[in-house]
């Protein structure tokens, strides 16, 4: 927000050529400097195995200040979460690059049934104090059925959501051990107020 | 930025009902018209084979004014590069659609080792005068191990970065001959100041 | 837009210390409150089979007000279309998650020719009154050649385009029966004025 002793005062006129309207006609519009908006781009770090609870995908933790990573304008990162400092519409995005090895899913199908493939999943989750359970905002999920090889591939997600001050965002993955944490440009998470 | 002889002058008041504060109390806030921000969307063209250095992915060149492509507000395109005219936070994105043929990677694994799969990679790279090495901002990389078929698939990337005036952006790919250059909606590159 | 009797009046000065310039020098800059810009995020619903013309991909219809979905600031959704209420540069995005079953594309290639693989395609299309043909803005297309399994995977698209008031946007897919309509976070479509 434009911060000074008072507020941004933008005057309105009925006619462009008219003199300034008297001050009691001033309209206080919520204009703000774009550079002042909450923004963050977080990059991957090596994940320390943490306990996660049954039926819940583990959350990734992130680098928030080194290299390409940053948080600014009251957007803070702590303990796996991006903390939303101001209500509004945010564009939220993440890419997770996975890598692993599969060799069993091309086997002959037993009993005429196709094998259930392995899969990789990324979820961007919102935790809010105004709702009793986490809300899945975005999900990218993909079957992985490569034939006898080391495989690697990214899942990218991004969309706009209305968030409230105090909301928390995290990125959950189906299997933390498959996440490629080697390069900051391969796996990342960000959000910015529109 | 709002460009005129001087700068956008937005006055602040301690009290909403007060007369305009004297001019020495004016605060010059970086408000700007959104339509005035540097923006570009570039679309694919047929690539002319160019020499590139060993261990360095070749850069794509782009259409910048025909069809869906445009550059505006001092964001210029020249010689494979988007030129950043103003420091700030930019959202940068690209999609590259690849197509090719593979048939060898499902063969029996020799010596018990899985084959190293073929792969496709897109990198969005920043070149800064003040830094000797290009910086990889975004990478999408995917193993390709299709079974005896013509394959095609996109890699999409997008994220926010703090850029400096004079920075240059390019898109590099692992193999220029696999890029689908047939349609402007399949392979593209863009950036806009937030 | 900042809406009052007149327009936002932002004065310019050649020198910061100078008195206010006379009113005939005022420049009316298109400053606007960010929260007032047209925006929409639409989420998947179960698709009712509708007739579509040969050689034309069917359009998805969407949820526009329940759950995560919303339209605001004169951006309206009607009959598969997002309606653009104001000219400007928009970021447009969509993800479609597909799921299906394939088992035939790894068969021995007949006559030395690789099989034409199955494929999945998403297109974001613009319809303009002043132009007879729809314009394909974005396309994500992918061969699907999984070996004897149930498969699922997303295609994500997003980019910036200059749109005109009255333009209409839709999302077309190659096969509506393969779209995963089960969760609002898997398949979605959105746009916002920059």
């Amino acid at each position: 927000q434009l911060r000074a002793q008072g507020e941004a005062c933008v005057q309105f006129q009925a006619l462009k050529g008219q003199e300034f309207a008297p001050s009691h006609q001033q309209v206080y519009a919520p204009l703000r400097a774009d550079g002042d908006k909450p923004r963050a781009h977080l990059t991957v770090v090596r994940q320390t195995p943490t306990q996660h609870f049954k039926n819940q995908f583990p959350a990734l933790h992130w680098e928030h200040e080194l290299g390409l990573a940053f948080t600014k304008n009251r957007m803070n990162y702590t303990n796996k979460f991006l903390l939303i400092p101001e209500s509004g519409d945010y564009f939220i995005y993440s890419q997770v690059t996975f890598r692993g090895m599969t060799s069993e899913c091309s086997e002959i199908r037993q009993a005429g049934r196709p094998n259930k493939p392995d899969s990789i999943t990324v979820v961007i989750t919102k935790v809010t104090d105004s709702y009793p359970e986490p809300t899945q905002l975005l999900m990218g999920t993909k079957s992985v059925c490569e034939v006898g090889s080391n495989w690697f591939q990214p899942i990218y997600l991004g969309a706009m959501f209305s968030l409230q001050e105090g909301d928390k965002l995290m990125v959950n993955v189906s299997d933390i051990s498959l996440v490629d944490y080697t390069k900051e440009d391969k796996t990342f998470f960000g959000a910015f107020l529109l | 930025q709002l460009r005129a002889q001087g700068e956008a002058c937005v006055q602040f008041q301690a009290l909403k009902g007060q007369e305009f504060a004297p001019s020495h109390q004016q605060v010059y806030a970086p408000l700007r018209a959104d339509g005035d921000k540097p923006r570009a969307h570039l679309t694919v063209v047929r690539q002319t084979p160019t020499q590139h250095f060993k261990n360095q992915f070749p850069a794509l060149h782009w259409e910048h004014e025909l069809g869906l492509a445009f550059t505006k507000n001092r964001m210029n395109y020249t010689n494979k590069f988007l030129l950043i005219p103003e420091s700030g936070d930019y959202f940068i994105y690209s999609q590259v659609t690849f197509r090719g043929m593979t048939s060898e990677c499902s063969e029996i694994r020799q010596a018990g080792r899985p084959n190293k799969p073929d792969s496709i990679t897109v990198v969005i790279t920043k070149v800064t005068d003040s830094y000797p090495e290009p910086t990889q901002l975004l990478m999408g990389t995917k193993s390709v191990c299709e079974v005896g078929s013509n394959w095609f698939q996109p890699i999409y990337l997008g994220a926010m970065f703090s850029l400096q005036e004079g920075d240059k952006l390019m898109v590099n790919v692992s193999d220029i001959s696999l890029v689908d250059y047939t349609k402007e909606d399949k392979t593209f590159f863009g950036a806009f100041l937030l | 837009q900042l809406r009052a009797q007149g327009e936002a009046c932002v004065q310019f000065q050649a020198l910061k210390g100078q008195e206010f310039a006379p009113s005939h020098q005022q420049v009316y800059a298109p400053l606007r409150a960010d929260g007032d810009k047209p925006r929409a995020h639409l989420t998947v619903v179960r698709q009712t089979p509708t007739q579509h013309f040969k050689n034309q991909f069917p359009a998805l219809h969407w949820e526009h007000e329940l759950g995560l979905a919303f339209t605001k600031n004169r951006m309206n959704y009607t009959n598969k279309f997002l309606l653009i209420p104001e000219s400007g540069d928009y970021f447009i995005y969509s993800q479609v998650t597909f799921r299906g079953m394939t088992s035939e594309c790894s068969e021995i290639r007949q006559a030395g020719r690789p099989n034409k693989p199955d494929s999945i395609t998403v297109v974001i299309t613009k319809v303009t009154d002043s132009y007879p043909e729809p314009t394909q803005l974005l396309m994500g297309t992918k061969s699907v050649c999984e070996v004897g399994s149930n498969w699922f995977q997303p295609i994500y698209l997003g980019a910036m385009f200059s749109l005109q008031e009255g333009d209409k946007l839709m999302v077309n897919v190659s096969d509506i029966s393969l779209v995963d309509y089960t969760k609002e976070d898997k398949t979605f479509f959105g746009a916002f004025l920059l």
């Epitope: 609870f53 702590t78 009793p132 | - | -």
Partner: antibody
């Protein structure tokens, strides 16, 4: 399993302070928000406020803002409610609960009695 | 703050009966939540986000409504349902509870 266990009953004199604890198990408190609710004898429920353990960010009902302080210790998965300058009208059962994760969980309640 | 008014204050019913209780908000809210409290126990969430049944809650409980008017319905009252029921809104700060409806045996 997922549960919240609160500290035992307290008897305090007017003007004193009390600190009630609420220990979480079966979940990471940083993944949720911890709320405090007051119930005076024979009365209904009153929401006092909540804390986000991940950030320490708090929101209070204005009527509790001055004398209630919510904190957490993430290393022990414990939330605390401290009430200062106690008065007789603070006599009540105080419950902790969580939001942001189902199932909904409440502590068993801590009775605070303020009496001279 | 948003004031929630529950009615009736007390509701008498016999086992097997259908009962409904109301919660009216002083201004529009996004969602309503319903809790059950028995003497000497902590409240228990029954319904979240207006109409979603919380885990382990029998399906004889249901919630409905929007805007300012919300309803909790018990299709066939069981003996263990006699308790106090509170609505709560989470839309405005501060959170607020209604004054409660006591369901008693007729």
């Amino acid at each position: 399993q997922v549960q919240l266990v609160q500290s035992g009953a307290e008897v305090k004199k007017p003007g004193a302070s009390v600190k009630v604890s609420c220990k979480a198990s079966g979940f990471d408190i940083c993944d949720t928000y911890m709320h405090w609710v007051k119930q005076a004898p024979g009365q209904g429920l009153e929401w006092m406020g909540r804390i986000d353990p991940a950030s320490g960010h708090t929101k209070y009902d204005p009527k509790f803002q001055v004398r209630a302080t919510m904190t957490t210790d993430t290393s022990t998965s414990t939330a605390y409610l401290e009430l200062s300058s106690l008065r007789s009208e603070d006599t009540a059962v105080y419950y902790c609960s969580r939001s942001g994760g189902l199932p909904d969980v409440w502590g068993q309640g801590t009775t605070v009695t303020v009496s001279s | 703050e948003i004031v929630l008014t529950q009615s009736p204050g007390t509701l008498s019913a016999s086992p097997g009966e259908r009962v409904t209780m109301s919660c009216r908000a002083s201004s529009s809210v996004s969602y309503m939540y319903w809790y059950q409290q028995k003497p000497g126990q902590a409240p228990r969430l029954l319904i979240y986000a207006t109409s979603n049944l919380a885990s382990g809650v029998p399906d004889r409980f249901s919630g409905s409504g929007s805007g300012t008017d919300f309803t909790l319905t018990i299709s066939r009252v069981e003996p263990e349902d006699f308790a106090v029921y509170y609505c709560q809104q989470w839309s405005g700060n501060p959170r607020t509870f209604g004054g409660g409806t006591k369901l008693e045996i007729k």
